[in-house]
Amino acid sequence: VPRWRQQWSGPGTTKRFPETVLARCVKYTEIHPEMRHVDCQSVWDAFKGAFISKHPCNITEEDYQPLMKLGTQTVPCNKILLWSRIKDLAHQFTQVQRDMFTLEDTLLGYLADDLTWCGEFNTSKINYQSCPDWRKDCSNNPVSVFWKTVSRRFAEAACDVVHVMLNGSRSKIFDKNSTFGSVEVHNLQPEKVQTLEAWVIHGGREDSRDLCQDPTIKELESIISKRNIQFSCKNIYRPDKFLQCVKNPEDSSCTSEI
């Protein structure tokens, strides 16, 4: 008799999840020699331990603490780039600007990027059929809790000037319900962080509006100012040119507005 299995609204665990996490961990230590002390088997065991045999709507930040401990990493606190709804460009930027870091440039972010995972209460099985959806099922699911935990720690570590890349093509350029809006903004430490600088990325070729005047950006400014952190905002009218100028800052066309 087939065992009854809870059907969730979200996609199931990414195929080859254990193999992918382990391989990513080894790759990360290969390309970041300063992390060679990390034991990837222990990292996988801690990752697995956070959600296996647990109800996938009952996951806590505490469940991820062993993994957080193993993945402890020091990134330059003044070189942090946050992003919201514009991951690809943020990653293209840190690929060129090698001294800046998104969460996915850290070990824990790199391990989980684009993956889905969940288990089942009282069985050691990974659920490849379905996992809880944040909206339709529950917010305390393994994936959401993981990103909330690592995002909070990442924001808490930031200092001096923190940059955030925002998607100017979205109806809500700043969304209070995004990970940036609900977690990172509230965990920047005013005693360490002097300024949050937003880069609003324009989508349209001929879009010359000042999106820094958008009501949602004003809302972000208000939240940040109330937390005793200064706020500044820049329009990035031409993201392609922006990246090109980061690559080749001495290019003559890079002195004008981008």
């Epitope: 193999e19 391989a23 080894v26 790759k27 290969e30 390309i31 020699p33 690929q95």
Partner: antibody, heavy 120, light 107 residues
Framework: QMQLVQSGAEVKKTGSSVKVSCKAS????????MHWVRQAPGQALEWMGW????????DYAQKFQDRVTITRDRSMSTAYMELSSLRSEDTAMYYC?????????????WGQGTLVTVSS | DIQLTQSPSFLSASVGDRVTITCRAS??????LAWYQQKPGKAPKLLIY???SLADGVPSRFSGSGSGTEFTLTISSLQPEDFATYYC?????????FGQGTKLEIK
């Protein structure tokens, strides 16, 4: 079994570019960093750079920074190394290589090599 | 960049001999060192990784030792197929670097 098969020998003119391919089989392409190493005739081995095939992220030796581009095609399980502004000193055997994850970070697997000859 | 200096550059020996090749690093590389064997027209073959671990399928007459800045590759009893060029490589830091090679010839 695990194999890295490289494209054939190339003869190129000074100032032109060459693109060498490395097709991986027998393993999950995205699970391993791919490196490129070259060896001029009678000379030592020289590391050029790496690519993470999963994300396309790269890093290059300073010496080649301005002239080398490593890319990949995930659907073809193939990595590419393009070297531009060729000069006679670039005449060499070019290899792709990867670790085994169980052998430290030494290169346990190598392509057969692609000879690039640069002539004026 | 980390420099690796191999000695000797050339070595003549006979079948059955015990030979030792040295690799000296310009800074501490812990045990992040590999040894390769290369024959003419062929790709290098990994012999030793992490300074002293034998790669799969490599005969036990090959051994590696050392850590920090001084490393050695020893072949306990030379066989005819061992005549080749040997390279050390550090993977402690990027850019990865190789020694200049030691050519082992038949006496």
């Amino acid at each position: 079994q695990m194999q890295l098969v490289q494209s054939g020998a190339e003869v190129k003119k000074t100032g032109s570019s060459v693109k060498v391919s490395c097709k991986a089989s027998g393993y999950t392409f995205t699970d391993y960093i791919m490196h490129w190493v070259r060896q001029a005739p009678g000379q030592a081995l020289e590391w050029m750079g790496w690519i993470d095939p999963e994300y396309g992220r790269t890093d290059y030796a300073q010496k080649f920074q301005d002239r080398v581009t490593i890319t990949r095609d995930r659907s073809m399980s193939t990595a590419y190394m393009e070297l531009s502004s060729l000069r006679s000193e670039d005449t060499a055997m070019y290899y792709c290589a990867r670790s085994a994850h169980t052998t430290g970070f030494g290169f346990a697997y190598w392509g057969q090599g692609t000879l690039v000859t640069v002539s004026s | 960049d980390i420099q690796l200096t191999q000695s000797p550059s050339f070595l003549s020996a006979s079948v059955g001999d015990r030979v030792t090749i040295t690799c000296r690093a310009s800074e501490d590389i812990y045990s992040n060192l590999a040894w390769y064997q290369q024959k003419p027209g062929k790709a290098p073959k990994l012999l030793i990784y992490d300074a002293n671990s034998l790669a799969d399928g490599v005969p036990s007459r090959f051994s590696g030792s050392g850590s920090g800045t001084e490393f050695t590759l020893t072949i306990s009893s030379l066989q005819p197929e061992d005549f080749a060029t040997y390279y050390c490589q550090q993977y402690n830091n990027y850019p990865y670097t190789f020694g200049q090679g030691t050519k082992l010839e038949i006496k």
